[in-house]
Amino acid sequence: ATKLTEEKYELKEGQTLDVKCDYTLEKFASSQKAWQIIRDGEMPKTLACTERPSKNSHPVQVGRIILEDYHDHGLLRVRMVNLQVEDSGLYQCVIYQPPKEPHMLFDRIRLVVTKGFSGTPGSNENSTQNVYKIPPTTTKALCPLYTSPRTVTQAPPKSTADVSTPDSEINLTNVTDIIRVPVFN
């Protein structure tokens, strides 16, 4: 089995994690993507996901998490604003492909949030939820959602489609040339 690697991000409370998950291949542009947390010994939990099909440059905000899928650049931008110590944990960007396991993009992200501000250039000390406030018309929660202590989520919509059949499979093969560019605002 392939060993899963992690990339560590150390940030202070109030800062913003800004990650760009590059999927490069055009065939995945409209695929639904998600940001997940992995707690020790548990199945991953979905924190937020894009629409189905994923819309270009269409921001989705769930609490302090913002997802933007840029089809033309082949990347999913994930921002977690106003970080709190309890946000520390292991995260991953994935492409949904039910009923198969999600396809994980890049290394998992080990986020460590500590108290206090770093005071370093570009650390975005003033980052708050208001900085990235998205108009209500684009604020959506489209997945079964994990509710963390400081993340307000909405209930998922009632599904009218039964996607438990193989008809909904997305075939992911030859996923190569994948890189991730960490960006700190």
Partner: antibody
């Protein structure tokens, strides 16, 4: 349509290992889903044992983890359960099921296809 | 582990009655809750997933609601084939996936 069929000994002696197999027809295990085991003691409720993906990734119930092994054979399109050091408390109807978890499907999750179940009695 | 408590453990009702079964989780499980129906000698059958979504092929008289810790399964007009035991199931903090103790719906 997708069908699951459990098979294995109906009687197991205490301290021995219970072994069951679930044969899947109408769907290739390699195409997706987790494949799991659930049991139901006589007159009682349901207890999830664990599940496996075709890649070999497994999830187990912590209360049984030390005694449970679930494996998969994609060439035969089947998966198996082994439960060691059994006691009378392991007497139950054992079901296999197809499972889809919320982290891999944003619109649907649950155990949508079940086998008929097989009764296993632990007794000397 | 998250404990799932169903109430009542059993109930008697007549054909045509509206039946409500509740399930309470020991901590918030968002909407990661499913409902199953089990008839004697048979395997469970998935009725409702994600708290309120009706599984394909399940009659519309079945409905689910709730989020967080409190959930409800409602049968709007009980039919003869609905007499069975109903289980809730959480898939939030997993493993383990856990089930409620069951509610047996009997004929009055």
């Amino acid at each position: 349509q997708v069908q699951l069929q459990e098979s294995g000994p109906g009687l197991v002696k205490p301290s021995e290992t219970l072994s069951l197999t679930c044969a899947v027809s109408g769907y290739s295990i390699s195409s997706g889903y987790y494949w799991g085991w659930i049991r139901q003691p006589p007159g009682k409720g349901l207890e999830w044992i664990g599940s496996i993906y075709h890649s070999g990734n497994t999830y187990y119930n912590p209360s049984l983890k030390s005694r449970v092994t679930i494996s998969v054979d994609t060439s035969k399109n089947q998966f198996s359960l082994k439960l060691s050091s059994v006691t009378a408390a392991d007497t139950a109807v054992y079901y296999c099921a197809r499972e889809l978890y919320a982290y891999s499907s944003p619109m649907f999750y649950g155990m949508d296809v079940w086998g008929r179940g097989t009764t296993v009695t632990v007794s000397s | 582990d998250i404990q799932m408590t169903q109430s009542p453990s059993s109930l008697s009702a007549s054909v045509g009655d509206r039946v409500t079964i509740t399930c309470r989780a020991s901590q918030s499980i968002s909407r990661y809750l499913n409902w199953y129906q089990q008839k004697p000698g048979k395997a469970p059958k998935l009725l409702i997933y994600a708290a309120s979504s009706l599984q394909s092929g399940v009659p519309s008289r079945f409905s689910g609601s709730g989020s967080g810790t409190d959930f409800t399964l409602t049968i709007s007009s009980l039919q003869p084939e609905d007499f069975a035991t109903y289980y809730c199931q959480q898939l939030y903090h997993a493993p383990p996936i856990t089930f409620g103790g069951g509610t047996k719906v009997e004929i009055k």
